[in-house]
Interface confidence: medium
Amino acid sequence: APTSSSTKKTQLQLEHLLLDLQMILNGINNYKNPKLTRMLTFKFYMPKKATELKHLQCLEEELKPLEEVLNLAQSKNFHLRPRDLISNINVIVLELKGSETTFMCEYADETATIVEFLNRWITFCQSIISTLT
């Protein structure tokens, strides 16, 4: 059974991940971002199901395309360069889902825009955090 300290650590990691994802979304949604139209043409795979930490495998697998789109944007709205943002997210995701578990991600048939993709994972983080508090 998870201890209160491990639950607290998980909660903090999820909050960190949530902040990173929200920062990216805010940078993209900034009305001054001239590349938003181009960024919205890129398609992201969405998880069929995202209710447990192991489902973060689906986010991990989409971090490379996410980094590519952020590279293209190279927006001044981001305080961190894309590589550092992705590195931060990747490390948190690996810790949360556990690197030993081999979970095969199942994706929904419909692809999504970067905004829909980020909103989906933001909702996921918020949902898990609410069950921990």
Epitope: N71, R83, S87, V91, L94
Partner: antibody, heavy 124, light 106 residues
């Protein structure tokens, strides 16, 4: 089919120059960083140089800095390596390789497509 | 340049064995490590990128782990076609390869 074909290798005397070329096809060349990697006979791999998709960022291994120059012509889907002041230790099979990540400006990722290499022999 | 030290340099194993190759960076490279397989007379083939992400089309018996300075490539059950040389590479600052690990038949 994604393909990289190197050319320009050969036998050259120490101190002389050589230009290697790499012709790319089957992918959007100007989206990706590109690299030169070499392998001396019976040895491991050595990264030589890399260039970002828009030529805005260029890097070299310490062993070739100041002697080698990487460049690309996106209109011709071509990558080049100008090798000056060649030394015996530059003798190797030179591979052209495509980076994995699109639009990387400051850095490199991993190399997912490689050519078959062109041999450079530096000897008197 | 960041140094990448691979161990062992040669590894003798049999089909079905679990094989582990280690790579140590001279300074932290975060998760920016790739692993390649190379067979004699052939160009290297990308297996793992970003320390643990499996390249498309690579069998799931290959896995990578680690972050910071310590990285591992594991082959869960060695197959006849896996006898080759394996190279690690950091791409945090420029790029540097390890010296290679030859996996040979015991």
């Amino acid at each position: 089919e994604v393909q990289l074909v190197e050319s320009g290798g050969g036998l050259v005397q120490p101190g002389r120059s050589l230009i290697l070329s790499c012709a790319a096809s089957g992918f959007t060349f100007d989206d990706y960083a590109m690299h030169w990697v070499r392998q001396a006979p019976g040895k491991g791999l050595e990264w030589v140089s890399g260039i970002s998709w828009n030529s805005g960022s260029i890097g070299y291994a310490d062993s070739v800095k100041g002697r080698f120059t990487i460049s690309r012509d996106n209109a011709k889907n071509s990558l080049y390596l100008q090798m000056n002041s060649l030394r015996a230790e530059d003798t190797a099979l030179y591979y052209c390789a495509k980076d994995q990540l699109r639009w990387g400006t400051y850095y490199y990722y991993g190399m997912d497509v490689w050519g078959q290499g062109t041999t450079v022999t530096v000897s008197s | 340049d960041i140094q990448m030290t691979q161990s062992p340099s040669t590894l003798s194993a049999s089909v079905g064995d679990r094989v582990t190759i280690t790579c140590r960076a001279s300074q932290s490279v975060s998760i920016w490590v790739a692993w390649y397989q190379q067979k004699p007379g052939k160009a290297p083939k990308l297996l793992i990128y970003k320390a643990s992400s499996l390249e498309r089309g690579v069998p799931t018996r290959f896995s990578g782990s680690g972050s910071g300075t310590e990285f591992t490539l594991t082959i869960s059950s060695l197959q006849p076609e896996d006898f080759a040389t394996y190279h690690c590479q950091q791409y945090d600052t420029g790029a540097t390869f390890g010296q290679g690990t030859k996996v040979e038949m015991k």
